[in-house]
Interface confidence: low
């Protein structure tokens, strides 16, 4: 339905508060270096303009597209050229090229200072002094650091952030109340950002068809009682929502997400029995709850898949008539029967089925050719099962920190050209799969583990894309979305890598390590471990373990010393010499 003024339409649909928040998120995700005050000024100008259009949709410029209005506003920023360099060239383009240009300049790893959490009293004072500014700052700081954060979900995080301060700033022990809540929001926020980044990568790098296949598989697992037509409708609507958000169309995205939640709740009887509680919540909580809802129970007595997809004489006819619909039905039927499989495994099976039909439906005896197609699935299913079993055993034996270290060594040997901070970040996240998924029973381990690994490996892919240094990473990231994890798993030690020159400075530590949090101290040690492997890629596990044990003892000893700095200087030299000898550097 066409509206005379798109900006007035969205302002009325979303309300002033959400409109302003979403415009702030959009601007901060595009111009990630701009000061907070500049963004607030731009948002206020857009909001005042939107109000004039609500009053009179025929007013001047009210008929312009949102991209035109927002792009024109962003291009008024005086420091665009000096702050963003070539991004300023986007402003010379016309829509839709201008928006595409802005999108291409989004930076997954912007050069911004680490967010430091002030003291609780300082935060509570700021919250009470100006609640609106305090919450806007939260949106701004998260959005600029996570330029693909799912905007309507960020509104939900901001609502929880506000609730935490409202409750805890009145508590007797403010810190005890607030800090765990902020930690939880931070961890959930990072996870949410990474999950959304994969959705956007899927759409932008592999296209709508890839995203829709993912959505069919996931929604069929979640809503196994829903009819195929119902799942297809949800997939179409969900694809529109994520296409909009990934494309920077945040007002449309939030509006359409609200409509989708409304539709799901109005039709929950034909979708899932698990939606009742979600549908009683307010809008932001409702949408979040639906997105996280547990899988419904599988219908009893589902017939064998073989009848329709292998034994039927009409397989090739049905496939030829509507390939994507037929493959969609296969994926739907397989996924609703297999909540115990990861989505990426289901997509691999569907791809194998498609490849077999492409080959066999052109053969002399198609049925004879594809009769054993399900047998081809067995090794595909067993590979992630075995991998998860082995890694969960290793995790249970080592614990999270040492399991991360094992992965650090493994991945540094596979792709040593990747920057040390990226290897540390990605390997630490890969290692978290243990505590996240290994506690689950067998039936839930694979969907938990492999789909989580897809999210983490996508982080590696987007960071590497910004500064490509390894052909092997590029190959695994670009060849097949669903085979990224098996591709990385299959990589062996990179024999072409020329070890890094030894630099004593890399292994020089100071007393400041003693005041770091446990997490930061781990990161320092893991950074040193990666550098060790880069210097000596052929070092054995035993050699590396010995050096890391010595290193841990050295840190512990010097942190207990009276003159810490002298201890770090003198004992550090000895440690470097001993490590060089142990590793033959």
């Amino acid at each position: 339905d066409a509206h005379k003024s798109e900006v007035a339409h969205r302002f009325k649909d979303l309300g002033e508060e959400n409109f302003k928040a979403l415009v702030l998120i959009a601007f901060a995700q595009y111009l990630q270096q701009c000061p907070f005050e500049d963004h607030v000024k731009l948002v206020n100008e857009v909001t005042e303009f939107a109000k004039t259009c609500v009053a009179d949709e025929s007013a001047e410029n009210c008929d312009k597209s949102l991209h035109t209005l927002f792009g024109d506003k962003l291009c008024t920023v005086a420091t665009l050229r000096e702050t963003y360099g070539e991004m300023a060239d986007c402003c010379a383009k016309q829509e839709p090229e201008r928006n595409e240009c802005f999108l291409q300049h989004k930076d997954d790893n912007p050069n911004l200072p680490r967010l430091v959490r002030p003291e609780v009293d300082v935060m509570c004072t700021a919250f009470h002094d100006n609640e609106e500014t305090f919450l806007k700052k939260y949106l701004y700081e998260i959005a600029r650091r996570h330029p693909y954060f799912y905007a309507p979900e960020l509104l939900f995080f901001a609502k929880r952030y506000k609730a935490a301060f409202t409750e805890c700033c009145q508590a007797a022990d403010k810190a005890a109340c607030l800090l765990p809540k902020l930690d939880e929001l931070r961890d959930e926020g990072k996870a949410s950002s990474a999950k959304q980044r994969l959705k956007c990568a899927s759409l932008q790098k592999f296209g709508e068809r890839a995203f829709k296949a993912w959505a069919v598989a996931r929604l069929s697992q979640r809503f196994p009682k829903a009819e195929f037509a119902e799942v297809s409708k949800l997939v179409t609507d969900l694809t529109k929502v994520h296409t909009e958000c990934c494309h920077g169309d945040l007002l449309e995205c939030a509006d359409d997400r609200a409509d989708l939640a409304k539709y799901i709740c109005e039709n929950q009887d034909s979708i899932s029995s698990k939606l009742k509680e979600c549908c009683e919540k307010p809008l932001l909580e409702k949408s979040h709850c639906i997105a996280e809802v547990e899988n419904d129970e599988m219908p009893a007595d589902l017939p064998s898949l073989a009848a329709d997809f292998v034994e039927s004489k009409d397989v090739c006819k049905n496939y030829a008539e509507a390939k994507d619909v037929f493959l969609g039905m296969f994926l739907y039927e397989y996924a609703r029967r297999h909540p115990d499989y990861s989505v990426v495994l289901l997509l691999r099976l569907a791809k194998t089925y498609e490849t077999t039909l492409e080959k066999c439906c052109a053969a002399a005896d198609p049925h004879e050719c594809y009769a054993k197609v399900f047998d081809e699935f067995k090794p595909l299913v067993e590979e992630p099962q075995n991998l998860i079993k082995q890694n969960c055993e290793l995790f249970e034996q080592l614990g999270e920190y040492k399991f991360q270290n094992a992965l650090l060594v493994r991945y540094t040997k596979k792709v040593p050209q990747v920057s040390t901070p990226t290897l540390v970040e990605v390997s630490r996240n890969l290692g978290k799969v243990g505590s996240k998924c290994c506690k689950h029973p067998e039936a839930k381990r694979m969907p938990c583990a492999e789909d989580y690994l897809s999210v983490v490996l996508n982080q590696l892919c987007v960071l590497h894309e910004k500064t490509p240094v390894s052909d092997r990473v590029t190959k695994c990231c670009t060849e097949s979305l669903v085979n990224r994890r098996p591709c990385f798993s299959a990589l062996e030690v990179d024999e072409t890598y020329v070890p890094k020159e030894f630099n004593a400075e890399t292994f020089t530590f100071h007393a400041d390590i003693c005041t770091l949090s446990e997490k930061e101290r781990q990161i320092k040690k893991q950074t040193a471990l990666v550098e060790l492997v880069k210097h000596k890629p052929k070092a054995t596990k035993e050699q590396l373990k010995a050096v890391m044990d010595d290193f841990a003892a050295f840190v512990e000893k010097c942190c207990k010393a009276d003159d810490k700095e002298t201890c770090f200087a003198e004992e550090g030299k000895k440690l470097v010499a001993a490590s060089q000898a142990a590793l033959g550097l």
Partner: nanobody, 115 residues
């Protein structure tokens, strides 16, 4: 009461140097990252540089990289900004902030670079 008091500003010729200080009180200085922010006449605040609580992780805006150095002395509860090779475009009020907020909570110190 959180207090941040900047000093060390002044008039300097292009190519000259200045060292700004920021004395902190009313909060545990050693537990927080700190930033320097500046505001040129008629412009919005611009983040300049940040340093983590321990003084090991430092970040700089592209416009001042290689010319300015941020440091801190936790024992003295003081943040520093050593500014070398100053240019006319560095003229601004400089102020320090907790974390990397660009909202000014202090008076700042005026730096003018002119011949």
């Amino acid at each position: 009461q959180v207090q941040l008091v900047e000093s060390g500003g002044g008039l300097v010729q292009p190519g000259g140097s200045l060292r700004l200080s920021c004395a902190a009180s009313g909060f545990t200085f050693g537990s927080f990252g700190m930033s320097w922010v500046r505001q040129a006449p008629g412009k919005g605040p611009e983040w300049v540089s940040a340093i983590d609580s321990g003084g090991t992780d430092t970040r700089y805006a592209e416009s001042i990289k290689g010319r300015f150095t941020i440091s801190r002395d936790n024992a003295k509860k003081t943040l520093y900004l050593q500014m070398n090779s100053l240019k006319p475009e560095d003229t601004a009020v400089y102020y320090c902030t907790i974390g990397q907020s660009t909202s000014r909570g202090s008076q700042g110190t005026q730096v003018t670079v002119s011949s």
